[in-house]
Structures are given as C-alpha cells and as structure tokens.
C-alpha cells in the first residue's frame, strides 16, 4: 500500500506563438482545479476498471480575474498535493491523465459551470520510494509543469511497496539475513515470503512463494529484462561486441507509439498496439470511459462502457463540447428579429420584443391598425411597430379624439394674435408684419417681402392659415 503524490507547479501558456486567451475575465471570474486518473501500465492485464489505480480531485484554486489587455499569465493554483492512495503493489509502470478544469463563478443557473481547459496523458516508469520526478506536458497552447512520486505507507517498503517492515526484536541489529528498513532504520525488513531468489527490485508477491514481475522484467525470478529489440533484425551491420545485428533506420525507430504503446512494422508503415486505456494511430488518445465521469454541467454519458468504445456526452441545453464543457452564448447568434432584446435564461432563450412585434423570436409584425379606429375622420398609419393616427383638421391626440386648439402652439410670429377658425387658425398680425403666420416684415416703403400679396388681402389684414 502507498500513496501516489502529484504536485502541480504551474499551468499557463506554453512557449511559442499563439498564446491562449486567459480563461477568466472581469465579467466571468474563475478558478482552476485539477483531476488525476491513474491506471496500471501493464498492457497484458485484462480489462481493468477505469482509473484502476485511483483518482483524485484537487481543491479549487484562488479566484482569478483577467487583467484587461494582459496576456494570460501562469494561473493561480490550488494549494497542496493531489494524493491517490493505492492499496496493492505499486505497478512500476503506470499511465496518467491529468485534467485542468475551470470553474466559472458568474451568475450560473444550476450552480457553477465547469469546463475542461486541458487534458494531458502519459505513461511513465516509476519506482516507489524514489525522489520526485519532474515533468512538463503540453496540451494545445497550454503548458502544465508538475512533479510526482510514489511512496509506500508503513509497514510497506521497496520499489513496489511489497516488502514489509517490522519493529526490531533486538535493540542493536536485525536478525540473520535481514536488512534495516531504509529510511526506517529502527525497523527491520520482515522475512521475505516470495519465491526464493525473486528479485527484490523487479519482482513482488502477494501470496507466499509467488514471484510476479513488474513491467519490463521477466523470468521465473524477474531477473531477465524484456528485450526491446530483437537480435535477429535483418537490417544493419553486425555488432562485434554483442553479436547482435544493430538495426538500421526503420519506421518503429524512436518508437512513434505514445503512452507505452508497442510498435510493429507493417509493409507500408507501422502499427501501434496500445495499452488498455489508450487508442489512436499513435496511442495518443486516452480511453476515458463513462465511469471516469467525463461529462460536466449535467451532461449524461452515453455509451463508452469500456475504453474500446467511445463515449458521447448528451449536453443539457446551454452547453456544448465533447464534455459539455463549453457554455453556449446563444444570444451571439442574434436570434431575436426586428430589434428584439435577447435573454439567455440558461434553460431557454427569451426575446423581449419591441412594440408592434411578437412571437418567440419577435418574428411576427403585428397589424398595428387592426381593430384601431381613429376618431373624427382620422386615418390609421402603420409604422415602426406602432400605430399612429393622422387626424382631420381640428382634431388631435393618439386616436384623434381630442378637439385641437390650433392656437395652443402660439403659431403667430412677431406678436400676431391667433384666432381659432372652423377651418384652422387665423393670425392677426402686428403692424409691420404679414404672412399666414405673420412671419414676413413689411418694408418701410410699403412693399412687402412677399412677391405679391394674395388677392383681396392688404398688408396688415389678418392672414388665414390654410
């Protein structure tokens, strides 16, 4: 038994062009958290449960708000380690998935929205009890720096946490053939129950007399390294030192298969045999299943009962993406017609329509004049989604129901007096002015500014406005 520990050092933009935009904004502050999933890297093992070695979720990091215009910095991280306890032997080779999640802290319907920012996967060889191993992984434009280690929980010790330590029976030294338990020097290694001669470094046992090998080792006592290249390779010159043929360049050189996949040559190229939990041409895709809980924001995981069948997330309205990690800004599609205001309520879109329009998307232009009578001989005019009455002379108001006082607006200029008349208004102009609204001065020599006075009217006569 023991604990796998993961320490995230930084998460931020990777080197090179195309720096990612900050995942948080002043409008949508957010915080990060991480998820780690561990699987044993024994490719020959039968179908194991997802995250068979265990999984862990970090605490939420500090709330972060983007500084406008600034490039995305390394983002503030949660405190502490991610710890994944393991009950049995440490397998020596393991595969990991580390996900970086963003929790949006805006006003969310149905709780905070989670979205997957980055997912990295890898396969590593690691002995328990060793020092921290440092790693850098890139996912798109993001870069994750982290360290990890596996440590045994007392009384277990060794590279696989399978040897047991017991308190010393004598104060000075351990019994015959038994070593002190580093780093617990005051304890002694318990008598080995594995098969005699089983390699303490590369073998372990869970039953007395057994010798099971860590990946990369074989033989009855786990002392023989598994050969990575055959000495029967037909390519290249013979090596004098080993008697083996040194392979020349081939499609599998440098092993193009990621995550511990094994490469085999084909007539045209190569083929990767991927360990369970990974797939793709180069085993670059991690085989997450529904049991790993890949669907966020209330998404339902469909299919994907095992790593060989892909899962699909059915996303609730308002979310999209392969993991329902993206909030849909449905108003950005401008669904409301005729100037309607768009409201995204989470479960539905609402359009607030301008006067004169109706329908779910304000698509119906109401007949503004339908059923609207303009009184006193007025006529209805449609326009801009609102009805208007053009009133007959002497009437006004929205529906032409008000008798108009034509003199209310003081239409006669230069001190002229206004008289209401059955056909409109009449201005009696002050001396020196003339015109329908007394707008024209009469010249001192008796000529007016008008080309000619209308017949029957002398300058100074009341002017009737027609």
């Amino acid at each position: 038994a023991g604990v796998f520990e993961l320490q995230i050092h930084s998460f931020g933009p990777g080197p090179g062009p195309g720096a990612p935009r900050s995942p948080c904004s002043a409008r949508l502050p957010c915080r990060l958290f991480f998820r780690v999933c561990l699987k044993p890297g024994l490719s020959e093992e039968a179908a194991e449960s997802p995250c068979a070695l265990g999984a862990a979720l970090s605490a939420r990091g500090p709330v972060y708000t983007e500084q406008p215009g600034a490039p995305a910095p390394d983002l503030p991280l949660p405190d502490g380690l991610l710890q994944v306890p393991f009950r049995d032997a440490w397998p020596g080779t393991f595969s990991f998935i580390i996900e970086t999640w963003r929790e949006e802290l805006g006003d969310q319907i149905g709780g905070p929205a989670w979205s997957l920012l980055a997912r990295v996967a890898g396969r590593r060889r690691l002995a328990a009890g060793g020092p921290w191993a440092r790693d850098i992984q890139r996912a798109g434009a993001w870069e994750l720096r982290f360290s990890y280690r596996a440590r045994c929980e007392p009384p277990a010790v060794g590279t696989a946490c399978t040897r047991l330590c017991r308190p010393r029976s004598a104060p000075s030294r351990c019994g015959p053939g038994l070593r002190p338990c580093a780093p617990l020097e005051d304890e002694c290694e318990a008598p080995l129950v594995c098969r005699a001669g089983c390699s303490p470094e590369h073998g372990f046992c869970e039953q007395p007399g057994e010798c099971r090998c860590l990946e990369g080792w074989t033989g009855p006592l786990c002392t023989v390294p598994v050969s990575t290249s055959s000495c029967l390779s037909p390519r290249g010159p013979s090596s004098a030192t080993t008697g083996c043929l040194v392979p020349g360049p081939g499609p599998c050189d440098g092993n193009p298969c990621a995550n511990g996949g094994s490469c085999s040559e084909t007539p045209r190229s190569f083929e990767c045999t991927c360990p369970r939990g990974f797939y793709g041409l180069r085993c670059e895709v991690s085989g997450v299943t529904c049991a790993d809980g890949p669907c966020f924001n209330g998404g339902l995981c469909v299919g994907g009962a095992d790593p060989d069948s892909a899962y699909i997330c059915h996303c609730p309205p308002g979310f999209q993406g392969s993991n329902c990690e993206k909030r849909v800004d449905r108003c950005s599609l401008q669904p409301c017609r005729n100037g309607g205001l768009c409201l995204d309520l989470g479960h539905a879109l609402r359009c607030r329509c301008r006067a004169g329009f109706a329908g779910p998307r304000c698509e119906h232009d109401l007949d503004d004049c339908a059923g609207r009578a303009c009184a006193n001989g007025g006529t209805c005019v449609e326009g801009g989604g609102a009805h208007r009455c053009s009133c007959a002379l002497g009437f006004g108001g929205r529906d032409c129901r008000e008798r108009a006082d034509p003199c209310a607006a003081r239409p006669c200029a230069h001190g002229g007096r206004c008289y209401a008349h059955f056909s409109g208004l009449v201005c009696a102009c002050a001396p020196g002015y003339m015109g329908a609204r007394c707008e024209f001065p009469v010249h001192p020599d008796g000529a007016s500014a008008l080309p000619a006075a209308p017949p029957g009217l002398r300058p100074g006569d009341p002017q009737r406005y027609l």
């Epitope: 319907i109 149905g110 709780g111 529904c290 049991a291 790993d292 809980g293 669907c295 966020f296 209330g298 339902l300 995981c301 469909v302 299919g303 994907g304 059915h314 609730p316 309205p317 308002g318 989470g346 479960h347 539905a348 879109l349 779910p360």
Partner: antibody, heavy 118, light 108 residues
Framework: QVQLQESGPGLVKPSETLSLTCTVS????????WSWIRQPPGKGLEWIGY???????NYNPSLKSRVTISVDTSKNQFSLKLSSVTAADTAVYYC????????????WGQGTLVTVSS | EIVLTQSPGTLSLSPGESATLSCRAS???????LAWYQQKPGQAPRLLIY???SRATGIPDRFSGSGSGTDFTLTISRLEPEDFAVYYC?????????FGGGTRLEIK
C-alpha cells in the same frame, strides 16, 4: 405553469404497436429534453428513452429494438411508439421533462394506463 | 448499467419521527448525479432532490439529501402525514438512466 398531458389508447392488442402522445404547455418543446418513463402496476419506475428537438434520441437498451420517440415542434408534442407489445408492457406510461441542471425529471404528466390484452 | 438498490424496502414510522432512506449504487455515481422522487398512490412522481443534496423548488427543508460515490441517503426530519409515500432514487451520471426499486414509507 408547465403541464404535460399523455394521450392515446388505453388498450392495445399483443404484437401490435403502442402509440402515445404527450402535449406540452407552458414550456417550449425546443428548450428541453423530453422523456418517457413507465411503471408496471405495483412495480417500480423504468426509463424508456428521451428526445431533444434537434432529433437526438437515447433509448433504454432493454427496449431499444422496439422503441421510437419523435417530436413535433409545431404542435409542442412528442410521441412514443413501442412495437410488438406483450402483456409485460402493461404499465402506466408517464411523459416527463428533463431538467436543465441534469438528466433528471422535473415535471411529469399524470400518466396513462395502457393495458396489453387481446 | 448502474444498478441502484434502495433499503429498506418498507419503513414504518410515526408522524414527528425522522426517516432515513438509503440508495446504494453498483458503481460510483460521478459528480453526485443522483435525484430523489416521492410518489403517492395514483399520482406521478415528484422531484425532491437533485445533485444528491440540492432541494427542488418548493420542497420543504425537512427533506435533505446526502452522500457521494456509491452511498446516498434521503433524510426526512419531523415526518408529516403527507410524507408517507414511496420514494425512488435515480442516477443521471450515465446511460441508461436507472431508478432504484423504491422504499415504501408507511405510518406505523
């Protein structure tokens, strides 16, 4: 107020197709997933399947070969067809709305009893 | 599929007492995607709890949900006469959506 109303024949002959319709009021059928659930007399609840207005469907594997759920957005309705029925399909059939926060059921119809008998 | 097992099958209590209903999943339910419903005779089920612990709109605070992973609990404190009914749990983590077999809460 969201309301769902199931309609359809209460009696279906064995080997025939059971057809039910759910009429929704108070909510747009285009804004939610919609589901069918059934309950044999005196027994527990069994999810049949759901549909989204876009045409996305998901059915219970135990019934998948016999089930079709469709949607009519113009009528704000969705429908269930269950073929080759037997007496074991006798149940109260409920239509329900799937919530926004996840695939659980926040509004239910009152249910309609369908008896399979010759 | 995730099989949900509810216990006890029947629970006999008196008004004013507290009821504890259990729902156990055959596999871990991610993100606590679990809901509880109440069903009275001749009626459709009514949503009580979602997300394992969030009360649905209009549900009195004497109903509370808890748990995570594979073990979930519905607690009804101070039982009222109208609380005697059948209660179902439902997981919505993955397809197919599944319900528990139900717990009948009856008056002692």
């Amino acid at each position: 107020q969201v309301q769902l109303q199931e309609s359809g024949p209460g009696l279906v002959k064995p080997s025939e197709t059971l057809s039910l319709t759910c009429t929704v009021s108070g909510a747009s059928i285009s804004s939610f997933y919609w589901s069918w659930i059934r309950q044999p007399p005196g027994k527990g609840l069994e999810w049949i399947g759901y549909i989204y207005y876009s045409g996305t469907t998901n059915y219970n594997p135990s019934l998948k070969s016999r089930v079709t759920i469709s949607v009519d957005t113009s009528k704000n309705q969705f429908s269930l067809k269950l073929s080759s029925v037997t007496a074991a399909d006798t149940a109260v059939y409920y239509c329900a709305r799937i919530a926004v926060a996840g695939f659980f059921f926040d509004y239910w119809g009152q249910g309609t009893l369908v008896t399979v008998s010759s | 599929e995730i099989v949900l097992t509810q216990s006890p099958g029947t629970l006999s209590l008196s008004p004013g007492e507290s009821a504890t209903l259990s729902c156990r999943a055959s596999q871990s339910v991610n993100k606590n995607y679990l809901a509880w419903y109440q069903q009275k005779p001749g009626q459709a089920p009514r949503l009580l709890i979602y997300g394992a612990s969030s009360r649905a709109t209009g549900i009195p605070d004497r109903f509370s949900g808890s748990g995570s992973g594979t073990d979930f609990t519905l607690t009804i404190s101070r039982l009222e006469p109208e609380d005697f009914a059948v209660y179902y749990c439902q997981q919505y983590d993955r397809s197919p959506l599944t319900f528990g077999g139900g717990t009948r809460l009856e008056i002692k």
